[in-house]
Interface confidence: medium
Amino acid sequence: ESALITQQDLAPQQRAAPQQKRSSPSEGLCPPGHHISEDGRDCISCKYGQDYSTHWNDLLFCLRCTRCDSGEVELSPCTTTRNTVCQCEEGTFREEDSPEMCRKCRTGCPRGMVKVGDCTPWSDIECVHKESGTKHSGEVPAVEETVTSSPGTPASPCSLSG
């Protein structure tokens, strides 16, 4: 896992409540599951289910947990050291080029092509030409051109959020 942080990820700063665990920074950094206090003297724990941090940091805030969108399923909940893992529902997928939404997988390949890859949460079905074996990357074919197939079962998580 890794951590590029964006504006929406930052949780509103809150004063450390009495129940929040504190520890001392190491080399000016706080461990995963914590953020640093404004004066830099303490590491303050993130709040389980609300925010998190994944690496050693000098963040003034923990990062706000992601909420899975409709059309997604939650594979694992947010902890203090790991963000929520969301995955597209069966029959839909998320492309790297358009990570903001899950798109419906095609139901089949155009005529003259064969399916060589199932629908997964991170990729559409894969079609190749029967003769040449070259991949098809066109638009969704018309219904009468399709050979129907059922979506594949997810094999591993497609997490955009840690």
Partner: nanobody, 124 residues
Framework: EVQLLESGGGLVQPGGSLRLSCAAS????????MGWFRQAPGKEREFVSA????????YYADSVKGRFTISRDNSKNTLYLQMNSLRAEDTAVYYC??????????????????WGQGTLVTVS
């Protein structure tokens, strides 16, 4: 479209220092998360460090904690990585990355939207 140009790589002895720079063109970087990843020969690309635009803090991989420092100069549209106490295992191509939009949560190398061409750091 954002262009990222890394510089500062080279050959250095163990225990030495280098400072990498990443100059961004095409837009201001001030509202965007940026970071560094690296890829050693025959290994997967891995996270090194990330910077939040508003001085909210920085992130570091365990392997570089206390040795590397990330910083940015928004007026120069440049991200830096100061690397001290370099080790042989730090040998890799170092890539600068930037988020595509301020709203997009990007937390994996696979999701980082804009990548530089990389600069080679050899510790030997």
């Amino acid at each position: 479209e954002v262009q990222l140009l890394e510089s500062g790589g080279g050959l250095v002895q163990p225990g030495g220092s280098l400072r990498l720079s990443c100059a961004a063109s095409g837009r201001s970087i001030s509202n965007y998360a940026m970071g560094w990843f690296r890829q050693a020969p025959g290994k997967e690309r891995e996270f090194v460090s990330a910077s939040v635009w508003n001085n909210g803090g920085n992130y570091y991989a365990d392997s570089v904690k206390g040795r590397f420092t990330i910083s940015r100069d928004n007026s120069k549209n440049t991200l830096y990585l100061q690397m001290n106490s370099l080790r042989a295992e730090d040998t890799a191509v170092y890539y600068c990355v930037v988020a595509r939009t301020p709203e997009t949560p990007i937390t994996s190398a696979r999701g980082a939207n804009y990548w530089g061409q990389g600069t080679l750091v050899t510790v030997s």
